[in-house]
């Protein structure tokens, strides 16, 4: 029961996390114009991974995509890649985990298969979450670096005066969404990995099944063939089920419901 709950909760948390990663990737507010201690401008700028937007005080908003690949910073391209990898891995993880859920029965899928699938999806969620956290952190680092490099100046040029407004950009809402979403996906993945341990079937050993023949002198060979003297009913060599390697404890035969007397 606890395993099912852990697995189910892990799935839900990861689902919310991946939805958050997708939302963050699509959001326009990765960086927003820093208005603190800035000259008054007529607009408010904010940018996403795919386009930049300008909002006027009247509410009029204009967004424009980055119609270039080469003109963009390598760091931005890296962030895009990390977020997309995170989404893809997360989506595959979700797909795998749906079939791995203990509460969902698909044909005669064994618990061991479900355990493996749960572990696989868990690892995928962990990597997905790490990709999102890494992507957002790289972007945040880029913002911090650019923030302290920006300057403002004023000079007189041809045809009048020019003033460079100190346009600095700070953390946008998408960064916080990304960090939280990545964290949730990571937590969900860890929960799936924990659930996997509970799902893995404990080895039930019926390795030394004793067939008691009516003959007098019966030699018992654990795990191999039952050697008979030739007297009584057991004239054929009967193969005893052997699950594989045995520990010292398993050498002796334990009575079970399969014992025939």
């Amino acid at each position: 029961m606890a395993v099912t709950a852990c697995q189910g909760l892990g799935f839900v948390v990861s689902l919310i996390g991946i939805a958050g990663i997708i939302a963050a990737t699509c959001m326009d507010q990765w960086s927003t114009q820093d208005l603190y201690n800035n000259p008054v401008t007529a607009v408010f700028n904010y940018q996403g991974l795919w386009r930049s937007c300008v909002r006027e005080s009247s509410g009029f908003t204009e967004c424009r995509g980055y119609f270039t690949l080469l003109g963009l910073p390598a760091m931005l391209q890296a962030v895009r890649a990390l977020m997309i990898v995170g989404i893809v891995l997360g989506a595959i993880g979700l797909l795998v985990s749906i079939f791995a859920l203990k509460c969902i029965r698909i044909g005669s899928m064994e618990d061991s298969a479900k355990a493996n699938m749960t572990l696989t999806s868990g690892i995928m969620f962990i990597v997905s979450g790490l990709c999102a956290i890494a992507g957002v952190s790289v972007f945040a680092n880029m913002l911090v670096t650019n923030f302290w490099m920006s300057t403002a100046n004023m000079y007189t040029g041809m045809g009048g005066m020019v003033q460079t407004v100190q346009t600095r950009y700070t953390f946008g809402a998408a960064l916080f969404v990304g960090w939280v979403a990545g964290g949730l996906t990571l937590i969900g993945g860890v929960m799936m990995c924990i659930a996997c341990r509970g799902l893995a079937p404990e080895e039930t050993n019926y390795k030394a099944v004793s067939y008691h023949a009516s003959g007098h002198s019966v030699a018992y060979k654990p795990g191999g063939f039952k050697a008979s003297t030739g007297f009584g009913s057991n004239t054929k060599n009967k193969k005893i089920y052997d699950g594989g390697a045995r520990t010292e404890d398993e050498v002796q035969s334990y009575p079970s419901k399969h014992d025939y007397v």
Partner: nanobody, 122 residues
Framework: DVQLQESGGGLVQPGGSLRLSCAAS????????MGWYRQAPGKQRELVAT???????NYIDSARGRFTISRDDAKTTVSLQMNSLKPEDTAVYYC????????????????WGQGTQVTVSS
């Protein structure tokens, strides 16, 4: 760089009208705001009227109802229609624009023209 060229200034009688025009040329990028500032002798430069790309207008109190600003984004021009002129409107009128670069990490620049003289006198 953006170059702003004003025209339309001159001498006019009180109660008269003038139309100032300004043409922007060069790397105009996205012109967030276009408008007019003025500076009377011995006074600070003051904002007269501005118009954003979205069409929002802003006027100085003394100009509201008398002055009308308009802009043509296709031609990157801005005009100021001044009616019922008063002697206190006498000043050098400067064309102004706030421009920003497009694409990643937009930077904002303010540009002013060299000015055109408006004299209101009888």
């Amino acid at each position: 760089d953006v170059q702003l060229q004003e025209s339309g200034g001159g001498l006019v009688q009180p109660g008269g009208s003038l139309r100032l025009s300004c043409a922007a040329s060069g790397s105009t990028f996205r012109m967030n705001v276009m408008g007019w500032y003025r500076q009377a002798p011995g006074k600070q430069r003051e904002l007269v009227a501005t118009m954003t790309k979205g069409g929002s207008t802003n006027y100085i109190d003394s100009a509201r109802g008398r002055f009308t600003i308009s802009r043509d984004d296709a031609k990157t021009t801005v005009s100021l229609q001044m009616n019922s002129l008063k002697p206190e409107d006498t000043a050098v009128y400067y064309c102004y624009t706030e421009v920003q670069t497009t694409g990643w990490n937009p930077q904002i620049y303010n540009y002013w023209g060299q000015g055109t003289q408006v004299t209101v006198s009888s």
